[in-house]
């Protein structure tokens, strides 16, 4: 048994009393203005879990997707930027693992996905407040951080299942597809556009949805822009963050998971053929960071509508490093 | 301030040893790959050895068998320890610093090896 | 292992000149290379890291470009204590491999 813990996935905003028409007026262009906004932004996800049988023992596994190739991972814990983060592990792909306590062991499961296993005692142990962070170095794309914690009402002996999301086929049919509706999407957002731009916009209600029931979406392409979209930027305190340890400074990101077929050539450590990706739960803070790996510390103005990004205060790599003092 | 100091080198005959030590501060020790790199004398520089933190080690082929890196974080030291040596390892020895994954920062002075009878 | 080839090896140039150094890869390495700086007699100091991020303390008039298998050093107005020897450094695999460098000289 386990308790799992993954950063929402947000959906838009119910209308309040408007008819059928306006529901899904208000709808559709809404979702395809997202996925015109999100399409080809590559994710990060985070999957938080605490074993039931060592209930200080966490397993943390993170997963990208995105085009480009991966050229650094580095998993750490205490929060994105400015709250200190401590780097647990960093994993290469051409150089090997590094890996400090309280880390027992890391490992490259797919080409894309990383899983981290943390020692359930002594003094640097975690605990289930403990926020934990994944950047994934991508070229060319840039830097990619997810963060994701257990939430603090996590019951080691439950184990709510994942809502189940649809697979993800990671072939050229796939692509040739997600494409064309994407482009379809786009021009027929245009279209409604143009249609209703002398009408009145209707007025925008609270979502109503319980923060425990989470609404199945039959597709939701960019967890990262999506999620940031929407999610105020909130901090965790770390009650058990490791004095022990020396700080870094990882930045918060987006996660949830699905299943995607991965091909799993020339990682050093041979790993599995599947990676587990996200998929929309409920629990935990999410944030995104775009900062190409080239220009560190040079971070754009703006990934997109309503991003939150965390720019690296101390400039391309200060004299302590690309993660801050270590 | 950053440091790193190296020591040990000196004049040595062909088949002898040598151990060069590096004394780093300023900086968390642990947290950083040590490298040695060499230089002869008029050539280029030449990567040696790596030692990652918990003590992962890579070395240059030609002194693979002959070289043994090794670290002691509770001293923040890095050492080299040479054997068989011959008359090609003559160079300056830098102690290099690396962030992993991100390249090579911050050199030390070096320190000199003669290999010669 | 990965070859680093640097050109040219050595260059004649003036104070305010613009001077571009190259590295080739025999192999694609992303953006994992740096650029050093070494004076006669010092220990190599980086410029560059990632390809093309200046290092923390380095003046503006340096930069760096490229990615994969083709790499360059620019400076673009030279000084008097830019005369030095340059090295390209790749850090993507083992073993880690420097350029052959390129001396600056002065014109």
């Known amino acids: 048994m386990r308790t799992e813990a993954q950063v929402p996935a947000l959906q838009p905003p119910e209308p309040g009393l408007e008819g059928a028409m306006g529901h899904r007026t208000l709808v559709l262009p809404w979702v395809l203005l997202t996925l015109c906004v999100t399409a080809g932004t590559p994710e990060v996800w985070v999957q938080v879990r605490m074993e039931a049988t060592e209930l200080s023992s966490f397993t943390i596994r993170c997963g990208f997707l995105g085009s480009g190739s991966i050229s650094l991972v580095t998993v750490s814990w205490g929060g994105p930027n400015g709250a200190g983060g401590t780097t647990l592990a960093v994993l290469h792909p051409e150089r090997g693992i590094r890996q400090w306590a309280p880390a027992r062991q890391a490992r490259w499961e797919t080409q894309s996905s990383i899983s981290l296993i943390l020692e359930g005692s002594g003094a640097s142990s975690p605990c289930a407040n403990t926020t934990f962070c994944c950047k994934f170095a991508s070229f060319p794309e840039g830097s990619w951080e997810a963060c994701g914690s257990l939430p603090p009402s996590s019951d080691p002996g439950l184990s709510a299942p994942p809502t189940p999301a649809p697979i993800l086929r990671a072939d050229l049919a796939g692509i040739l597809g997600v494409s064309g509706v994407l482009l379809f999407g786009c021009v027929y957002l245009l279209h409604l556009l143009r249609r209703h731009k002398h009408r009145p916009a209707p007025r925008l209600q609270p979502s109503r949805t319980s923060p425990q029931a989470p609404r199945a979406r039959a597709w939701a392409p960019s967890q990262a822009s999506q999620a940031a979209l929407h999610v105020p930027y909130a901090t965790i305190n770390t009650s058990c963050r490791p004095a022990t340890l020396d700080t870094a400074h990882p930045h918060g990101g987006p996660s949830w998971w699905a299943s995607l077929p991965t091909h799993a050539a020339h990682r050093p450590q041979g790993p599995a053929a599947w990676a587990s990706t996200p998929i929309p739960a409920r629990g935990s803070f999410v944030s995104v960071e775009n900062g190409l790996y080239a220009q560190a510390g040079e971070r754009p103005p703006h990934t997109g509508p309503g991003l939150t990004l965390f720019p690296d205060p101390r400039g391309p790599r200060a004299m302590e490093g690309p993660l801050g003092v270590r | 301030e950053v440091q790193l100091v190296e020591s040990g080198g000196g004049l040595v005959q062909p088949g002898g040893s040598l151990r060069l030590s590096c004394a780093a501060s300023?900086?968390?020790?642990?947290?950083?790959?040590m490298h040695w790199v060499r230089q002869a004398p008029g050539k280029g520089l030449e990567w040696v050895s790596d030692?990652?933190?918990?003590?992962?080690?890579y070395y240059l082929g030609s002194v693979k068998g002959r070289f043994t890196i090794s670290r002691e974080n509770a001293k923040n030291s890095l050492y080299l320890q040479m054997n068989s040596l011959r008359a090609g390892d003559t160079a300056v020895y830098y102690c290099?610093?690396?962030?992993f994954g991100y390249g090579m920062d911050v050199w030390g002075q070096g320190t000199t090896v003669t290999v010669s009878s | 292992d990965i070859q680093m080839t640097q050109s040219p090896s050595s260059l004649s140039a003036s104070v305010g000149d613009r001077v571009t150094i190259t590295c080739r890869a025999s192999?694609?390495?992303?953006?994992?290379l740096g650029w050093y700086q070494q004076k006669p007699g010092k220990a190599p100091k980086r410029l560059i890291y990632?390809?093309?991020s200046l290092q923390s303390g380095v003046p503006s008039r340096f930069s760096g470009s490229g990615s994969g298998t083709e790499f360059t050093l620019t400076i673009s107005s030279l000084q008097p204590e830019d005369f030095a020897t340059y090295y390209c450094?790749?850090?993507?695999?083992?073993?880690?491999?420097f350029g052959g460098g390129t001396k600056v000289e002065i014109k």
């Open positions: 290099v610093r690396e962030e």
């Open positions: 030692i990652g933190n918990s003590g992962e080690t």
């Open positions: 300023g900086f968390t020790f642990r947290n950083y790959d």
């Open positions: 990632a390809a093309s």
């Open positions: 192999q694609g390495i992303r953006n994992d």
């Open positions: 450094l790749q850090h993507l695999d083992y073993p880690l491999t």
